[in-house]
């Protein structure tokens, strides 16, 4: 059986403060606790949540935590369930209110030697008791004319008279603690010889040059006097005026009227009522000049037919506050319908093409009118005026594709090229009129081409197929110099393309005809054999019917090609010795020989004292050092051909001898001694 | 012996009323909570109430309104009361005192 | 509305495999931990497996274990044995005194 432990008790809470409903149970089995108010579940909150099986309160509410708690084990899996004994709170609070008039019904009605009673609204548990101020002095129970009710908050005036006026508040405290009242009364019972307000004068805004009119009335008995005052405290009367006020009138009702109102007759105006007894009644008003400011200017605004679109007019600073409209071909838009005005806002539904055009705001107010155009601008699907066309452009010249439509506004005109954007570099230029100019056509360039024009309305496309007419050409023109070796087999090739395949032949560039050896075999030169005689000047002519012909002219050079009679071997030498590296090379044209060391040629004008490049092409370096060490190439060059070897440079100490090593004792590798 | 016997099902025809019984021995139900689980036809298992200790009870949103769950203590016996009965309420209805302890079910067929 | 989604809804194994269910609730159950596996055969009332996320029912095999909190548990068996094919429901409570089921996980033969 569920078992608790630990029982939930009805317990003094404070509003606001922290509490917790104990409870613990004991079961032969895992159970899940939870709480019920008033038979309810209670849903967890920041406030009030279960803190393992009791239930906390991080701040106590009387109104929400008012009821019957309890709390409830049951053992999910056998269904059992346990209920513990029933807990409240009684929760001690004080709230703060208002002091407000109980008698009579309306301040209107409060008269003289008639009996006023006013309520302090603070409340609480247990109820508090309460102390009454006027003008923050506290009022005894008991005193003269008047009486306190603790039990109904009351305070009761009785005859109220002028002595009774000021400023009333009330305190409570209690178990719980203290509250002020949050709003407090003013009681003004007046003296008849006391000057009271009748009509008092209100802000005025006038355009410039405009009258403007206060009134100001108060009464007392005797009657009371009515002075004005302007800013800088000089008075006005119809005797005496400054100097800045000379067209203002004081009528014997009191109301002040200014005539032709100049900027410096902005300000504050102040009417003085004064009774026989009492202290001075004083009313301010403001006079401003009305002004308007200039209107922002509106961006063209493009929109799309059947959309529903919006433009805000910001109206203008302004004294009075601007009235704003709008207006459409010199009509005001309605408040309602297809196209209206809503607010501050133009809006246009369900958009016609009709609707494009100037759109006015206005704004106004009696400083002057100021307005502001909005272009609007219905956007059109493009149309074609010309489609790109399927085309054969020429190889090597400018070659143009139209793609010329007509939309509102200006349609925006790219191109693809097999499907990729066309970004406008030295070879593709987009015109304004949306044609394509490829400016030196390429074999390649023979492909689709799409174009898209577009406007915010949509957009069309069209492609088109260009066909390349390639130019009669070598592919590729042949090397104007080229060596043949010596003795050997030799080809030269050329090949040529154009509309039609061309056809291609060799002559020797002298006109004579080519020596029976020589081969000319669809366009490749073939030599079996090169002799010296072979060396001059050739011509390849390419021709076909629509193009002519076209002719590359070669120089043949026959050659020995490159042998080396001496390579540089791997050499050893001691540090601070000589080290010889051998190279000569022969061919025809007699070779020139180059040396490259550690990855660098080596400039025989900046080699330095310490090496040196003979004629027959060795190379040498004297007092060697072991940043010598490393790989030397011999490269040996002419015109027709070039040709390298290499070897290791290893620079070493020279080794102490030993006793046991005789004078003749040989190195363990190849070594120059000098 | 600590059992459930359902009982009270039927065929009822759409927009009709019928009330299941779950008569319990071996233990009384002040002391527990039951509940209601159906299951219809090749469908999986729904939780349609629960009665606790004592007697509140707590509904699946879908159930409110048209079913209501009530007991007799001094019979032991908890009842499922349906109203405006749809074809799609047709299940095997299945009482349940926690999770461990199931009756064996009662079939409701509701159809025209 | 409470929603509990039971991954797979169907699942095929052998003999000795482990296989895993997973069940998620679209709020978090009651305590963290309020939540109970079934296992059903056909035209039988559903037997109680774990309850309280891991705790195991009387005299079921250790094989069954569960895991989890909050909106996300496990149901584990961890060698299939020939009686374990059946469909599986999870069941979560909530605050409130509202529970809801899973829409059941079938284990299949493989």
């Known amino acids: 059986a569920i078992v608790f432990i630990k029982q939930p008790s009805s317990q003094d809470a404070l509003q606001g403060r922290r509490a917790l409903l104990r409870c613990e149970v004991e079961a032969p089995g895992p159970v899940h606790v939870y709480w019920l108010l008033d038979g309810a579940p209670v849903q967890d909150t920041e406030r009030r949540f279960a803190q393992g099986s009791s239930l906390s309160f991080a701040a106590v509410d009387r109104l929400q935590d008012s009821g019957t708690f309890q709390c409830v084990a049951r053992d999910d899996v056998t269904g059992e369930e346990a209920r513990s004994a029933n807990a409240s709170f009684n929760i001690k609070w004080i709230e703060a209110g208002p002091v407000v008039l109980k008698h009579p019904a309306s301040e209107a009605e409060i008269q003289p030697q008639t009996q006023v009673t006013l309520r302090c609204h603070i409340d609480g548990h247990p109820r508090p008791t309460y102390q009454w101020f006027r003008d923050g002095t506290p009022l005894s129970d008991g005193q003269s004319n008047h009486t306190v009710s603790s039990k109904e908050r009351n305070l009761t005036l009785r005859p109220a008279g002028p002595e009774h006026s000021g400023l009333y508040s009330c305190c409570a405290h209690s178990a719980f603690g203290q509250a002020c009242s949050s709003q407090n009364f003013t009681l003004s019972i007046a003296d008849e010889s006391f000057a009271r307000v009748v009509l008092a004068p209100q802000d005025v805004v006038v355009a410039r040059y405009e009258e403007a009119m206060f009134h100001c009335q108060f009464s007392a008995q005797p009657p009371p006097s009515l002075q004005w005052l302007f800013e800088d405290e000089t008075p006005i009367t119809n005797r005496s005026r400054p100097p800045h006020l000379r067209r203002a009138t004081v009528f014997a009702n009191g109301s002040l009227l200014l005539t032709q109102v100049r900027p410096r007759n902005a300000g504050i105006y102040r009417c003085i009522g004064q009774g026989q007894r009492g202290p001075p009644i004083i009313l301010e008003a403001t006079l401003h000049l009305a002004e308007i400011e200039d209107m922002p200017l509106f961006e063209p605004r493009v929109f799309t037919a059947g959309s529903e679109e919006r433009v805000t007019c910001l109206p203008p600073k302004g004294l009075p506050e601007p009235s704003v409209w709008w207006e459409h071909a010199g009509v005001r838009l309605p408040t309602h319908g297809r196209v209206y005005q809503k607010g501050h806002e133009l809006v246009l539904a369900n958009i016609a093409e009709s609707d494009a055009g100037v759109y006015t705001c206005h704004a106004a107010n009696l400083a002057g009118q100021r307005r502001q155009d909005v272009n609007i601008t219905v956007a059109t699907v493009p149309s074609w005026l010309k489609k790109p066309q399927d085309s054969q452009l020429e190889e090597g010249k400018p070659g143009y594709l139209d793609c010329l439509t007509q939309a509102t506004p200006k349609p925006t005109v790219v191109w693809y090229r097999n499907q990729m954007l066309i970004s406008e570099d030295s070879r593709f230029e987009v015109f304004k009129n949306g044609t394509l100019r490829i400016n030196s056509v390429e074999v390649y360039d023979g492909t689709w081409y799409r174009c898209m024009s577009s406007t915010p309305a949509g957009s069309i496309e069209a492609q088109a197929r260009v066909q390349v007419l390639e130019k009669l050409k070598f592919t590729p023109p042949p090397q104007p110099q080229q060596c043949m070796e010596f003795d050997k087999e030799a080809t030269v090739p050329c090949s040529a393309t154009g509309r039609e395949k061309p056809t291609i032949k060799w002559e020797r560039a002298d006109g004579s005809s080519l020596p029976e050896w020589v081969t000319d075999n669809a366009g490749t030169l073939h030599f079996a054999r090169v002799t010296r005689d072979d060396a001059g000047n050739y011509t390849c002519i390419a021709s076909n019917g629509p193009q002519g012909q076209i002719r590359a002219h070669v120089q043949l050079t026959v050659a020995v090609f490159i042998t080396f009679k001496v390579e540089p071997e791997r050499t050893t030498v001691y540090q601070g010795h000589t080290a010889l590296l051998q190279c000569e090379a022969q061919g025809d044209p007699k070779p020139l020989i180059q040396w490259k060391g550690k990855d660098r040629i080596l400039d025989p004008t900046k080699l330095g004292p310490r090496m040196h490049i003979f004629q027959n092409g060795s190379l040498v370096i004297h007092d060697v050092a072991p940043e010598d060490s490393g790989r030397y190439t011999c490269i040996a060059g002419n015109s027709c051909n070039i040709k390298h070897t290499e070897a290791p440079l290893y620079v070493v100490d020279k080794p102490v001898p030993e006793e046991s090593e005789g004078p003749g004792s040989p190195p363990p590798y190849k070594m120059i001694q000098t | 012996e600590v059992q459930l016997v359902e009982s009270g099902g039927g065929l009822v025809q759409p927009g009709g009323s019928l009330r299941l019984s779950c008569t319990a021995s071996g233990f009384s139900l002040s002391n527990y909570v039951m509940n209601w689980v159906r299951q219809a036809p090749g469908k999986g298992l729904e939780w349609v109430g629960i009665i606790d200790s004592s007697g509140s009870t707590y509904y699946a949103s879908w159930a409110k309104g048209r079913f209501t769950i009530s007991r007799d203590t001094s019979k032991n016996t908890v009842y499922l009361q349906m109203n405006s009965l749809r074809a799609e309420d047709t299940a095997v209805y299945f009482c349940a005192r926690g999770l461990y302890l199931w009756g064996q079910g009662t079939l409701v067929t509701v159809s025209s | 509305e409470i929603v509990m989604t039971q991954s797979p809804s169907t699942l095929s194994a052998s003999v000795g495999d482990r296989v895993i269910i997973t069940c998620q609730s679209s709020q978090s159950v009651y305590h963290n931990n309020l939540l109970a596996w079934y296992q059903q055969k056909p035209g039988k009332a559903p037997k109680l497996l774990i309850y309280?996320?891991?705790n195991l029912a009387s005299g079921v095999p250790s094989r069954f274990s569960g895991s989890g909190s909050g909106a996300e548990f496990t149901l584990t068996i961890s060698s299939l044995q020939p009686d374990d094919f059946a469909t599986y429901y999870c069941q979560g409570g909530y605050n409130g005194n509202i529970y809801a089921f899973g829409q059941g996980t079938k284990l299949t033969v493989l």
């Open positions: 309280y996320t891991s």
